[in-house]
Amino acid sequence: DSSKWVFEHPETLYAWEGACVWIPCTYRALDGDLESFILFHNPEYNKNTSKFDGTRLYESTKDGKVPSEQKRVQFLGDKNKNCTLSIHPVHLNDSGQLGLRMESKTEKWMERIHLNVSERPFPPHIQLPPEIQESQEVTLTCLLNFSCYGYPIQLQWLLEGVPMRQAAVTSTSLTIKSVFTRSELKFSPQWSHHGKIVTCQLQDADGKFLSNDTVQLNVKHTPKLEIKVTPSDAIVREGDSVTMTCEVSSSNPEYTTVSWLKDGTSLKKQNTFTLNLREVTKDQSGKYCCQVSNDVGPGRSEEVFLQVQYAPEPSTVQILHSPAVEGSQVEFLCMSLANPLPTNYTWYHNGKEMQGRTEEKVHIPKILPWHAGTYSCVAENILGTGQRGPGAELDVQYPPKKVTTVIQNPMPIREGDTVTLSCNYNSSNPSVTRYEWKPHGAWEEPSLGVLKIQNVGWDNTTIACAACNSWCSWASPVALNVQYAPRDVRVRKIKPLSEIHSGNSVSLQCDFSSSHPKEVQFFWEKNGRLLGKESQLNFDSISPEDAGSYSCWVNNSIGQTASKAWTLEVLYAPRRLRVSMSPGDQVMEGKSATLTCESDANPPVSHYTWFDWNNQSLPYHSQKLRLEPVKVQHSGAYWCQGTNSVGKGRSPLSTLTVYYSPETIGRR
């Protein structure tokens, strides 16, 4: 009801002699703060005095002082909500009831807590799941209803007295709800853990043994089996007898059914722990095991490989790989069912025994065409020799052999001829299916392996062909040796290196790029006139008259070729200068007189200078000197000078006579 103080704490606390007890406690007083606190041991209410009698373990005074003998018991609470207590060490005679006498200004309360102190450390308690099954992870819990800050403890797990390898998780609780220490161990038990002893050991901080709890594990598991066979090596000959026995080394719960399996398939009507095989045949070879089931599931024994021995069966040959490519490696495998495995083999190629080949495999590192044919073998073991099987065919494939390019034309071949070539080979596997030609051109292939070159070019030097099956084999190139007239004939000036000046020594060369045949003749010509028959045309001192259009010709037995016309240009200073007068050398005053400086020059005159009879230069520089109107004073001798890049030339004097007009004479 509302007149009660509210307390929360564990109902009973457990400890042992010499340990300690920590009592988590909270309260709520009816009014105000706590003024007085007494801790009683086994308090009893005295109706006469209206007070509690009993041993006072702890007493708080108004001034807060605590008598020194009370150090064993500590009140760790406060005046309004915490009433936690500690007793360290705790003694056997502390067992019983603790009474917390609380007083506030106006209210009083007695709260009781049970304390159970044993003489020796009490054992923890192991909690197991209801069922433990092999390979399924379980959690083992070890619980101890004790925890105290002043007395550290540890819980250790042991399997058959040996510390367990798995890591345990220890947790403690010191709350108003519960006080305990708990260790949880997760592990996946195996069948062999069945019946084994697991211990949770309580130890003090130094690892000293205090107490323990023990359980024997009950691990449910499928039957664990051992298979025994007679004979023990499980190797017999056809017609022998074999006995196999299945032993159950452990099963939990008990087994219910037994069966036998061969190569994973159940054997019918074999439901006992002994399997008897009488007069075995080779088909009974295989992997045998027994299977025993219980409520958890089936358990299987290890497999026994029963080998029924017999002489080799007719052999077959496996070729890796056929068809084979010449130069590759090939392996032949002789396959013959036999037990024990054959120890000796005889190999045949096209019916003839292959010497020195006694292994199961024949390896030819580099296959050649002659290796083709039929391969067969015979296998042999301790029980006898097998028969030769049908054999296997080795097909050796190779590129076409000895490929040649053949010119069908009569020789020599001339430029412009039609040339026919054929591509020949010696042998091929598989057959040749196509041909290739090098270099490529817009040529005809009138039939397989034949090439027709219409209008053969002078530069068709070599042709090669390839015969192709899965691979192409190229012939060595064949030279067509096409003959042609000299090519690219041209005139080339050898000297001088710069432009030709009159008087220079000049050499012209007749060049050509190629000629087949090589033997040639040269001809030089100017304006249709033959000048020479050497490759060079030489001028010791060139004159302007030598200028003109030159051609050279080169000929061989096939034909002749002319160069383009080449213009020879000779540079010279102005020459043959003269002054011509228009309309004449006698002109009437007042009229117009034009003097022209005529010359022969290469390059043409670029600059003219006019002089009078006093060799006085006149301020005129063009080719024509125009006097208009002409005066009598203009009469006299004139001359001109012409200049080009080569030099200067001057004319002789030419006299101009200017006479008076009739008007002037009439005035006089």
């Epitope: 054992p123 197991l128 209801p130 042991l158 399997l159 058959e160 007295g161 040996v162 195996q190 062999s192 853990h193 069945h194 019946g195 084994k196 002893i197 211990t199 709890d213 023990t214 359980v215 024997q216 009950n218 664990k224 051992e226 032993e247 080394s249 452990s250």
Partner: antibody, heavy 116, light 112 residues
């Protein structure tokens, strides 16, 4: 110290049943399985089965299957082995025993005689 | 179940002799989790319960004289009495306890 104290000798007629007790002391009864073993005169020791007193789980040797029942009373720390359909070849000394981590503890044995 | 085969089934010897008894299990009794062989040796005298001599194949039980020794691992085990004493004439049994319990057929050691 660990002690296993068995009940006294029994004489039974063929076809009858016998129930032998084994009182354990000196250890926590539920911590260890309790096994039963018998030995006919001049014969090898023969395992009969066990009980796990913690959960009353039992396992028996198949040769006794259907004839043997092992039970346990946690309140008195006593295990029982009952063998039914007795025949003369069941005449033997019957022992209860248990494992420790290292050692084994045996009862003193109970002679069961099957005679007409 | 695991079968135990003891040999010899009986032997005659004199005080002071060295005696060797062998025991073979049909399967290994080695428990790999703790690397121990779950094989025990017992001595039994007429009218008495079996007395444990050796556990874990080679560990002597407290109070057993050191003339008794056990050896072996897996499937093959041996009990050796180095110098036979008068009180050693008895029947000796091997027992596997890896999976349920199975006993050997016993070896009777008699006075020559």
């Amino acid at each position: 110290q660990v002690q296993l104290v068995q009940s006294g000798a029994e004489v039974k007629k063929p076809g009858a049943s016998v129930k032998v007790s084994c009182k354990a002391s000196g250890y926590v009864f539920t911590s260890y399985w309790l096994h039963w073993v018998r030995q006919a005169r001049g014969q090898r020791l023969e395992w009969i089965g066990y009980i796990n007193p913690r959960n009353d789980y039992t396992e028996y040797n198949r040769i006794f299957k259907g004839r043997v029942t092992i039970t346990a009373d946690k309140s008195t720390s006593t295990a029982y082995m009952e063998l039914s359909s007795l025949r003369s070849e069941d005449t033997a000394v019957y022992y209860c025993a248990r494992r420790g981590i290292t050692t084994f503890y045996w009862g003193q044995g109970t002679l069961v005689t099957v005679s007409s | 179940d695991i079968q135990m085969t003891q040999s010899p089934s009986s032997l005659s010897a004199s005080v002071g002799d060295r005696v060797t008894i062998t025991c073979k299990s049909s399967q290994s009794v080695l428990y790999s989790a703790v690397e121990k062989n779950y094989l025990a040796w017992y001595q039994q005298k007429p009218g008495q319960a079996p007395r444990l001599l050796i556990y874990w194949a080679s560990t002597r039980e407290r109070g057993i004289p050191d003339r008794f020794s056990g050896s072996g691992s897996g499937t093959d085990f041996t009990l050796t009495i180095s110098r036979l004493e008068p009180e050693d004439f008895a029947v000796y049994y091997c027992k596997q306890y890896l999976s349920s319990w199975t006993f050997g057929q016993g070896t009777k050691v008699e006075i020559k």
